[in-house]
Each structure stands twice: as C-alpha cells, then as structure tokens.
Interface confidence: low
C-alpha cells in the first residue's frame, strides 16, 4: 500500500486533518522535500541577523550578520561581534592582543608570533599586535662573506592584494 503522503511535492505538506491531501505550506513556512507531513517554520533573520535569501515555499531563508558582526556555526547560526585587527573578543568585549601575540583579522583569537629560531631563522621584521613576525635567513647565512640574499616579500593573507 503506497503512502498517500509520498505524492505531496516540495512546498506542500500531507495534511492529516484533511484526509491526507497535499496542502500548500502556509505563509512563512516551507518544505524542501516531497512527502513531508509538516512544513517547517521559515527562519527569521532578526536582530543582528539580516536576510541573505528570502524564504520560499520550498526553501528556508538564509541569514548573514549585520555590519560589525560575523557569522559563526553551520548556516550562520550565530553572529559574533567583530573586533579590530590586533584585538580578540573576550567575555568583556574586544581586548588588545597581549605582547607576543597577534590577530590580523576582525574575528578569532590572538595567536603567538612565529618563533623564528625554532626554524633556525632570524627575525627579519618584528611582530605587532596586527601582524606576525617575518622570519629571515638563518643567522649563519648573514655571516660576513656570505652571498647576499634577497629578503622575502612580506607575508600576506591569501586572497588579499598587497597593501
């Protein structure tokens, strides 16, 4: 015996209150697959969330965050406050990175500067709250008589053009 609900397309629900006919999803609800026995309530992008894609009868709304906030979690389930570069978000708000750490983004935590000496290299450019140190050639390479080495270009984030 075929389940009569299996004939209900996306955008409808199998309405047991009405002898299992396929009723259209009411306003502000959707069903993204066929054979659903209920429509899901559309996500509402309220407060710090803003609507990236409107809800339709067959797909949920999608949210992102208002300026000054960024998405966290699957499907932007949370919005977290942005901080400036050189800061991290704590329970008490945005705080400057401690000495020896940096954050080059508006989100995330401050991370320790690279320890150049672990790779046998020297510090070419000192770190700041916003930028990691730049490691240069090993101290041995800088001894008198060594051939000259072209300093590497400063590191930059992928996808960003040079300043």
């Amino acid at each position: 015996l075929q389940d009569p609900c299996s004939n209900c397309p996306a955008g409808t629900f199998c309405d047991n209150n009405r002898n299992q006919i396929c009723s259209p999803c009411p306003p502000n609800s959707f069903s993204s697959a066929g054979g659903q026995r209920t429509c899901d309530i559309c996500r509402q992008c309220k407060g710090v969330f803003r609507t990236r894609k409107e809800c339709s009868s067959t797909s949920n709304a999608e949210c992102d965050c208002t300026p000054g906030f960024h998405c966290l979690g699957a499907g932007c389930s949370m919005c977290e406050q942005d901080c400036k570069q050189g800061q991290e978000l704590t329970k008490k708000g945005c705080k400057d990175c401690c000495f020896g750490t940096f954050n080059d983004q508006k989100r995330g935590i401050c991370r320790p500067w690279t320890n150049c000496s672990l790779d046998g290299k020297s510090v070419l450019v000192n770190g700041t709250k916003e930028r990691d140190v730049v490691c240069g050639p090993s101290p041995a390479d800088l001894s008198p008589g060594a051939s000259s080495v072209t300093p590497p270009a400063p590191a930059r984030e992928p996808g960003h053009s040079p300043q």
Epitope: F13, N16, N17, P26, S29, R37, T38
Partner: antibody, heavy 121, light 107 residues
Framework: QVQLVQSGAEVKKPGSSVKLSCKAS????????INWVRQAPGQGLEWIGN????????NYNQKFKDRATLTVDKSTSTAYMELSSLRSEDTAVYYC??????????????WGQGTLVTVSS | DIQMTQSPSSLSASLGERVTITCKAS??????LSWFQQKPGKAPKTLIY???RLVDGVPSRFSGSGSGQDFTLTISSLQPEDIATYYC?????????FGGGTKVEIK
Amino acid sequence: QVQLVQSGAEVKKPGSSVKLSCKASGYTFSSYWINWVRQAPGQGLEWIGNIYPSDSYTNYNQKFKDRATLTVDKSTSTAYMELSSLRSEDTAVYYCTRTWEFYYDSVFDYWGQGTLVTVSS
Amino acid sequence: DIQMTQSPSSLSASLGERVTITCKASQDINSYLSWFQQKPGKAPKTLIYRANRLVDGVPSRFSGSGSGQDFTLTISSLQPEDIATYYCLQYDELPPTFGGGTKVEIK
C-alpha cells in the same frame, strides 16, 4: 497572552442538547485548530473532533459524528460545540484546546478551563 | 481506531526516585505520540510531543523515548509537584486516542 475561556456549567435532561462555547484571545484565531476533548468523572480523555476556523473544515471522532456539531464565529473568535440526544454517559468535563496548523507537529498547547455538563433526569 | 494501552495504571514512588510509564499502541504510530500531565480539577498539560520533544518550559527531568508501537515517559527524579495523572496520546491517525492514564503518587 493566549487564553481559551469556556462557558459555564450546564445541567441537562436526557434527550436534550447542549451548546458549549470557547472564546479565544491573544492569538490569530483562524490559524489554529480548535479541538474538543471530554473527560467523564474519574475517567480518561476522549477526543470529540476539531475545526479549523479559517475555513470551518471539521473532523469528527466517528463515535460522535451523528451527535456533535462544531462551529465557529470568526467575528468573535469563538468556537462552539453542540451535542445532541444527550444521555447520562455524556456527563463529563468538556475541554477546548488548540493545536497549530501542522497536524503532525501538533501540541495541545493551550486549554480552556473546562465546562462540566451534567445529564440527569 | 488505534488503541493505546498504558501501564501501570497507578504507581507509588519515593521523592527523588526514577519513574517510568509505558504506552503501547495497537499498531505502528511512527513517533506521533504526546505525553500529558493532569492534576486534579485542572486541564491537562502537554509535556512531550513527537515521542521525545520536550515542550518549552517543561523541566528537563521529564523525557520521552520510543517509536513504532512502544513508548516510555521517564521522570528522572520525582518531585512533589509531579504528583498527577499522566496520559499518552497517539496522533498518527484520526481520531487521536488517549491511553487510560497512570496515577503517580508519593510513597
């Protein structure tokens, strides 16, 4: 806040009819099913039927199909249940309760205070 | 109509004790089962729907499990305010039908 307020207690003779009311407030009346459930003294719960105020679509428990009539007055956000040919075993507390649009996610989330109907000669 | 058999019909338990009530459907009802609590002279109150989904505001000591034909309501640690009669309700098919109830008392 959401409220379902039912009419007062009734004493009826066998063979007569009774019409109970359930006035809704605090929500969009037409968007929720109104269900009627009864409970005989010291007994369990029994579903009588439901009605969708938006289009007055009704479902009845077969046991009550011939005797119960569910109606609504959208202008006053009131649901009614009329039960005819009363007999002594209809003595019970009658509750109205709402469920939302999607039957399969139903929750009887708000209930009226109940109306006691006593059928006695 | 689908028959709902609830057991036990009554039970006595100590405060803090774990309490389990079962409900058996006469046929497969998927997960379309609710649990209600009713105190004397009051309307029932829905605790759980879809077999295991807790209604907002219901204490987390209440939990539901099961699917198909066999379902369980558990109170993890019985409190004085839990003294009541509990009913299950199937709504897989019209008409919805209730179990006979389980009266929970303090030992």
